[in-house]
């Protein structure tokens, strides 16, 4: 069976939107009006992995682009990147672990924990126009809470 996917945008708990920053990075900033068109639309695929009521494994691809968020070690540190894939083979139900995030719902907010690196989360900073990254702390000054907005296909 084909993998189930939905299109969505994400905003952090400060209401910052996510946009492209160079070819292989995302950044977070406040957008208004026409600028909202800059925000990236994700194709969120529901993939194989450890699942529970509030924890669902997903892959986050960029809609109509052969780019997926992935988690890899760089200089011995878990790092978030946008990785190019062969569009003929992705998305798929059994995604490699580096592409998998545990979507965790808590109090109507979403967290995205790396399946490859437990307790590391997709994070943004309080500051404007700074990169989205993989952070190893929750509840500190880095932001790990997001809301999801559905986008029609």
């Amino acid at each position: 069976a084909p993998v189930r996917s939905l299109n969505c945008t994400l905003r952090d708990s400060q209401q910052k939107s996510l946009v492209m920053s160079g070819p292989y990075e995302l950044k977070a900033l406040h957008l208004q009006g026409q600028d909202m068109e800059q925000q990236v639309v994700f194709s969120m695929s529901f993939v194989q992995g450890e699942e529970s009521n509030d924890k669902i494994p997903v892959a986050l691809g960029l809609k109509e682009k052969n780019l997926y968020l992935s988690c890899v070690l760089k200089d011995d540190k878990p790092t978030l990147q946008l990785e190019s894939v062969d569009p003929k083979n992705y998305p798929k139900k059994k995604m490699e672990k580096r592409f998998v995030f545990n979507k965790i719902e808590i109090n109507n907010k979403l967290e995205f924990e790396s399946a490859q690196f437990p307790n590391w989360y997709i994070s943004t900073s309080q500051a404007e126009n700074m990169p989205v990254f993989l952070g190893g702390t929750k509840g500190g000054q880095d932001i790990t809470d997001f809301t999801m907005q559905f986008v029609s296909s």
Partner: antibody
Framework: EVQLLESGGGLVQPGGSLRLSCAAS????????MFWVRQAPGKGLEWVSV????????RYADSVKGRFTISRDNSKNTLYLQMNSLRAEDTAVYYC???????????WGQGTLVTVSS | DIQMTQSPSSVSASVGDRLTIICRAS??????LAWYQQTPGNAPKLLIH???SLQSGVPSRFSGSGSGTDFTLTINSLQPEDFATYYC?????????FGGGTKVEIK
């Protein structure tokens, strides 16, 4: 008054190491991104590295990637740049700078000179 | 990486002149552009951020304009203390990059 004071520069041989420090005062250091920017003698400005307030996010210029490491100690209000495998082309005045809105450098230190020569 | 090109690289002008410096980005950087002034032996000083916003304490004779790829710094009525080197810097994406600088000399 915002103040940034770099130290640790000096003469080092190619292949050697140096650790720069930047002591910050006059603002809440733990809330700000910080940069290192360098300027070779008689040349323009080159961005070197950035670190987020928590230290969780760092980025480097390609020219220093794998050789330099940026870090910070928020309890000491201090920014660091560990520089390894130094090359002649790393000779420059190194400035630390506070990051302002959207990624500009709104306050700068006076700089510390690093000379890599045999 | 985004390349930033400044022109002219140097210019001679007189006190009271109106001066325009141009900065071009190799791709759109929206409005994420800053301008700095540097005098010999000193650290750079932020003049303009977000392409058009005057940094606190900077005289109003300095102004910035532009968006996308083309930006200008204008100094209305040059003062003796304005003879310096000016740099633009893009903050749209890492690695951050600076223009090569424009040296403003006394004619």
């Amino acid at each position: 008054e915002v103040q940034l004071l770099e130290s640790g520069g000096g003469l080092v041989q190619p292949g050697g190491s140096l650790r720069l420090s930047c002591a910050a005062s006059g603002f809440t250091f733990s809330k700000y991104f910080m940069f290192w920017v360098r300027q070779a003698p008689g040349k323009g400005l080159e961005w070197v590295s950035v670190i987020s307030p928590s230290g969780g996010m760092t980025r480097y210029a390609d020219s220093v990637k794998g050789r330099f490491t940026i870090s910070r100690d928020n309890s000491k209000n201090t920014l660091y740049l560990q520089m390894n495998s130094l090359r002649a082309e790393d000779t420059a005045v190194y400035y630390c700078a506070r990051v302002g809105y959207g990624g500009n450098s709104d306050y700068w230190g006076q700089g510390t000179l690093v000379t890599v020569s045999s | 990486d985004i390349q930033m090109t400044q022109s002219p690289s140097s210019v001679s002008a007189s006190v009271g002149d109106r001066l325009t410096i141009i900065c071009r980005a190799s791709q759109s950087i929206n409005r994420w552009l800053a301008w700095y002034q540097q005098t010999p032996g000193n650290a750079p000083k932020l003049l303009i951020h977000s392409a058009t916003s005057l940094q606190s304490g900077v005289p109003s004779r300095f102004s910035g304009s532009g968006s996308g790829t083309d930006f200008t710094l204008t100094i209305n009525s040059l003062q003796p203390e304005d003879f310096a080197t000016y740099y633009c810097q893009q903050a749209d994406s890492f690695p951050l990059t600076f223009g090569g600088g424009t040296k403003v000399e006394i004619k």
